[in-house]
C-alpha cells in the first residue's frame, strides 16, 4: 500500500514539526493504525502510534510526543518537544487493520531538521 | 497464518524465560518480523520486536529485553530481566514482510510465570 509524506520539514524554534501522511485508500478501512518511526542508520525506533476508526477521531496517548487529526485517508501529524539531537528521518507507517484484508505501507520518510534556539541573554 | 507457541513457561530464578515461536511457512519468506506483545486485559503492549532476513540472523536492539535466534520457520525467543510483576500472557506476532504477499499471524500466547528470588542473607 502506498504511503506519501513530505521529504523535508523544518521544526519551529519551539521544537514543533508538522506533516501530512497520506495513504492509498482501500475504501472501507474502518480501523487504521498510524505509527511514526525514527530511522537512525539501520535502526528504527517508534516515536508514537495511534489507532483511529472511521467513527472516532485519531487519539494518541496523553503522554505522547505526537498529536494528530485524521480526515479520510490523510493524517495530519505533529511532533512536539524536538531538539537538535532529534534531527533525523521520520517514517510514517500506516496499517489498515480492519476489516480484512490487512494492509500495511510505509512512507519514504520525512527528514525533520531541528535547530536549537539561542539561549536568551540575561536581562539587566 | 498459523503461529504456534507453548502455553506456559516458567522463568528462571534469574528472570529469564525462553520459548519457541513457530509459524506456518509460506516457503520463500525472505524478511520476517517477530514481535512479542504482552496482553493485560484488553490492552496489548509491545515488549520487543526484531526483523530478520533469510541471509542474516535475528537481531533485537542492543537495549532490548529480548534476544533470539532463528532457524527456518522457528524463532527461539529469550526475554530477560523479568520480575514477578511481569507475569502474564506473552503473544508472538509474526509478519512475513517480503516478498509479497504480506502475511501476519499471532499465537495464542505463552503464559510466563515469574517468581522473584528470595534475597540472599547477609554474609557474616
Amino acid at each position: 500500500m502506498h504511503v506519501a509524506q513530505p521529504a523535508v520539514v523544518l521544526a519551529s524554534s519551539r521544537g514543533v514539526a508538522s506533516f501530512v501522511c497520506e495513504y492509498g485508500s482501500s475504501g472501507n478501512a474502518a480501523e487504521v493504525r498510524v505509527t511514526v518511526l525514527r530511522q537512525a542508520g539501520s535502526q528504527m525506533t517508534e516515536v508514537c502510534a495511534a489507532t483511529y476508526t472511521v467513527e472516532d477521531e485519531l487519539a494518541f496517548l496523553d503522554d505522547s510526543t505526537c498529536t494528530g487529526t485524521s480526515s479520510g485517508n490523510k493524517v495530519n501529524l505533529t511532533i512536539q518537544g524536538l531538539r537538535a539531537m532529534d534531527t533525523g528521518l521520520y517514517i510514517c507507517k500506516v496499517e489498515l487493520m480492519y476489516p480484512p484484508p490487512y494492509y500495511v505501507g510505509m512512507g519514504n520518510g520525512t527528514q525533520i531538521y531541528v535547530i536549537d534556539p539561542e539561549p536568551c541573554p540575561d536581562s539587566d | 497464518m498459523h503461529v504456534a507457541q507453548p502455553a506456559v513457561v516458567l522463568a528462571s530464578s534469574r528472570g529469564v524465560a525462553s520459548f519457541v515461536c513457530e509459524y506456518g511457512s509460506s516457503g520463500n519468506a525472505a524478511e520476517v518480523r517477530v514481535t512479542v506483545l504482552r496482553q493485560a486485559g484488553s490492552q496489548m503492549t509491545e515488549v520487543c520486536a526484531a526483523t530478520y532476513t533469510v541471509e542474516d540472523e535475528l537481531a533485537f536492539l542492543d537495549d532490548s529485553t529480548c534476544t533470539g535466534t532463528s532457524s527456518g520457520n522457528k524463532v527461539n525467543l529469550t526475554i530477560q530481566g523479568l520480575r514477578a510483576m511481569d507475569t502474564g500472557l506473552y503473544i508472538c506476532k509474526v509478519e512475513l514482510m517480503y516478498p509479497p504477499p504480506y502475511y501476519v499471524g499471532m499465537g495464542n500466547g505463552t503464559q510466563i510465570y515469574v517468581i522473584d528470588p528470595e534475597p540472599c542473607p547477609d554474609s557474616d
Epitope: 485508500s25 482501500s26 475504501g27 472501507n28 474502518a30 480501523e31 493504525r33 489507532t51 476508526t53 472511521v54 467513527e55 496499517e95 487493520m97 480492519y98 476489516p99 480484512p100 490487512y102 | 506483545l37 496482553q39 484488553s42 490492552q43 496489548m44 506476532k93 501476519v104 499471524g105 499471532m106 495464542n108
Partner: antibody
Amino acid sequence: QIQLVQSGPELKKPGETVKISCKASGYTFTNYGMNWVKQAPGKGLKWMGWINTYTGEPTYADDFKGRVAFSLETSASTAFLQINNLKNEDTATYFCARRGVRLDYWGQGTTLTVSS
Amino acid sequence: DVLMTQTPLSLPVSLGDQASISCRSSQSIVYISGSTYLEWYLQKPGQSPKLLIYKVSSRFSGVPDRFSGSGSGTDFTLKISRVEAEDLGVYYCFQGSHVPWTFGGGTKLEIK
C-alpha cells in the same frame, strides 16, 4: 440523519430470482462496508457476508456462496442483494446493515416469501 | 468458523432485577490489531436489531448506562443492572474478528 431504507416485501416462486435494495443516506456511502443478515421465521440472525462499497468486492459466508450475489449502484448510494434459483428455505427477512467497526445502522428489513 | 454460544436460551426476569447473559466463542476472537470485535444487539419483536455494545465494553451512543459489557478472549458477558419493560426482546452476541463473522443463537429476555 443516517438511514438505510430497504425495498418492500417480495412473494416469489421456487426457481425465480429476487433482488432486494438498500438505499443509504446521511453519510458517505463508500466509507462503510454494507453487510447482509438473514433471519428465517422464528429463528436467529445469520450473517450472509458484506460488500466493500469502495471497491465493490464481496465477501460471502460459506452457506451463501453460489446463489447469492451482492452488488452496488454507488451513484445512488444503494446496495443490492440478489438470490437466484429461489428455494423454500430462502423464506426469511433480510436486513442490510452498515459496518465500520460495528453494525451501527440497520435497514428495516425486507420479507421474502418463497412459495409455489 | 467461530461458533458463538449464548446462555441461557431464555431469561425470565422481574422488572428492576439485574440480568446477565453469557456468550462464549469457540476460539479467541482477539483480532491481529489487538482489538476484540465482540458486539451485543437487541432485537424487539417486529423490529431490526439495535446495537448496544461494541468492542466488548464500549456502549453505543444513546444506549442507557444500565447496559454494560465485559470479558476477554473467549468469554463475554452482557449485564443489565435494572431491567425495564423496554429491554425485553432477544439479545444476540456477534463476533466480527474472524471471517465468517458470526452471531450467537440469541437469548430471550422475558417477564417472569
